[in-house]
């Protein structure tokens, strides 16, 4: 458990940039937490290069990470959830790049699922509903959601909605008549704990109806 | 101001429990890890374990591992530490400690709880 | 588990004289943490992540050190940093050094 590199320890390896980049993620299999490391540049050469975490952890000083392909994993329930540790990318005994990271202010929540919008005719509005794995766990329960829509035509057009439940309503009357949207949605944590957006869920898509110009009202299609 | 203030003097007999209480005051409770530090008559200090108290998560030094038990009531921001089957060499000052979580260290102490065990 | 071994055991100096105190460890560590006690009263931070002074601490003690080897010094002392001095390391199980008393001469 070494701690920074000092400047003339390095030889070679201060050329090269071993910076990194980690997220968390909680109760991600069953009570076991998951933290995941890589290397901001994807041509750094990870052979015999190895990431360990020290430091608020229970009962254990160090955890090493498994190397897999391009990114390293740790999968474990020893994460105090508080505090920093000490992650530092390793060359045999001697540290090569180090960071303080708190556990809990990088997390990454599981991407929601089964989004879909129904259109509800007498209310003439569309209601969106998603899933997240997120409503079962322990910790990371509070959550912000994003989701996204567009027309399918607006290629960069995405209108943005930010809420904490897990259900929206679209008016119809902001929605162009008789066209295609799609719409996602991503999580990010709220309350305790922080971190970063999740990714997006898979897309759904769905069609408006066309207004019928007699009554005012529409007919879906 | 911050603040940790401890249960007064226990004596117990070889073999009982004895609980100890640490209520804080001043700040978040839930940010910062309470540790419990034990210093017997005439020695050093010996950490023996902590709790994160916004989750009940604990971690135990192996030396008392079975034997105390860390809990807390987040309502009145109060950790407890019960050590169980009591020795003569468990007569000691427990004291609680707030734990700076980005370095480590113990930044806040609370006044201390002699324990003293005696048949 | 890391152990951490203070010398001297005991310091006899004179006020307004420097006093060095070291902390040496089995392995090498990140960060180290000293403490002053007097008697009947609880520990106090003085120096945080080897170097640091903690929150009211007069600038005449200053810490340093790296991997093994880390030294707490008081540039000049004054009749109330007569106490005994513990190191501490920053991880589980969060070992503090046996202590070293620095009494008056």
């Known amino acids: 458990e070494s701690g920074y590199a000092q400047n003339g320890d390095l030889e070679d390896a201060e050329l090269d940039d071993y910076s990194f980049s980690c997220y968390s993620q909680l109760e991600v299999n069953g009570s076991q937490h998951s933290l995941t490391c890589a290397f901001e540049d994807p041509d750094v050469n990870t052979t015999n290069l190895e990431f360990e975490i020290c430091g608020a952890l229970v009962e254990v000083r160090c955890l090493n990470f498994r190397k897999l392909q391009e990114i390293y994993l740790i999968e474990t329930k020893k994460f105090l959830l508080i505090g920093n540790s000490n992650i530092c990318v390793k060359a045999g005994e001697k540290s090569l790049t180090c960071k303080n990271v708190n556990v809990a202010t990088i997390v990454k929540p599981e991407a929601p699922f089964d989004l879909s919008v129904i259109y509800r005719e007498g209310a003439n509005d569309f209601l969106v509903t998603f899933n997240t794995s997120h409503l079962q766990k322990k910790y990371v329960k509070v959550l912000m959601h994003d989701v996204a829509y567009r027309h399918e035509k607006d290629e960069n057009n995405w209108m943005h909605v930010n809420l904490s439940s897990t259900k929206l309503t679209l008016l119809q009357r902001k929605l162009q008549p008789k066209a295609t949207y799609e719409i996602k949605v991503r999580s990010i944590p709220g309350d305790y704990f922080k971190g970063f957006w999740s990714e997006w869920s898979p897309s759904y898509y769905f069609r408006t109806p066309e207004i019928n110009n007699h009554s005012g009202e529409t007919n879906p299609t | 101001q911050v603040q940790l203030v401890q249960s007064g003097a226990e004596v117990k007999k070889p073999g009982a429990s004895v609980k100890v209480s640490c209520k804080a005051s001043?700040?978040?409770?839930?940010?910062?890890?309470m540790n419990w530090v034990r210093q017997a008559p005439g020695q050093g200090l010996e950490w023996m374990g902590l709790i994160n108290p916004y989750n009940g998560v604990t971690s135990y030094n192996q030396k008392f591992k079975g034997r105390v038990t860390l809990t807390r009531d987040t309502s009145i921001s109060t950790a407890y530490m019960e050590l169980s089957r009591l020795r003569s060499d468990d007569t000691a000052v427990y004291y609680c400690?707030?734990?700076?979580?980005?370095?480590?260290?113990?930044?806040?102490w609370g006044q201390g709880t002699t324990v003293t065990v005696s048949s | 588990e890391i152990v951490l071994t203070q010398s001297p055991a005991t310091l006899s100096l004179s006020p307004g004289e420097r006093a060095t105190l070291s902390c040496s460890a089995s392995?090498?560590?990140?960060?180290m943490h000293w403490y002053q006690q007097k008697p009947g009263q609880a520990p106090r931070p003085l120096i945080y992540?080897?170097?640091k002074l903690a929150s009211g601490i007069p600038a005449r003690f200053s810490g340093s050190g790296s991997g093994t080897d880390f030294t707490l010094t008081i540039s000049s002392l004054e009749p109330e940093d007569f106490a005994v001095y513990y190191c501490?390391?920053?991880?589980?199980?969060?070992?503090f050094g046996g202590g070293t008393k620095v009494e008056i001469k």
């Open positions: 001043g700040y978040t409770f839930t940010g910062y890890t």
């Open positions: 501490q390391e920053w991880n589980y199980p969060y070992t």
């Open positions: 392995s090498s560590v990140t960060y």
């Open positions: 992540e080897i170097s």
């Open positions: 400690a707030r734990g700076d979580g980005n370095y480590w260290y113990f930044d806040v």
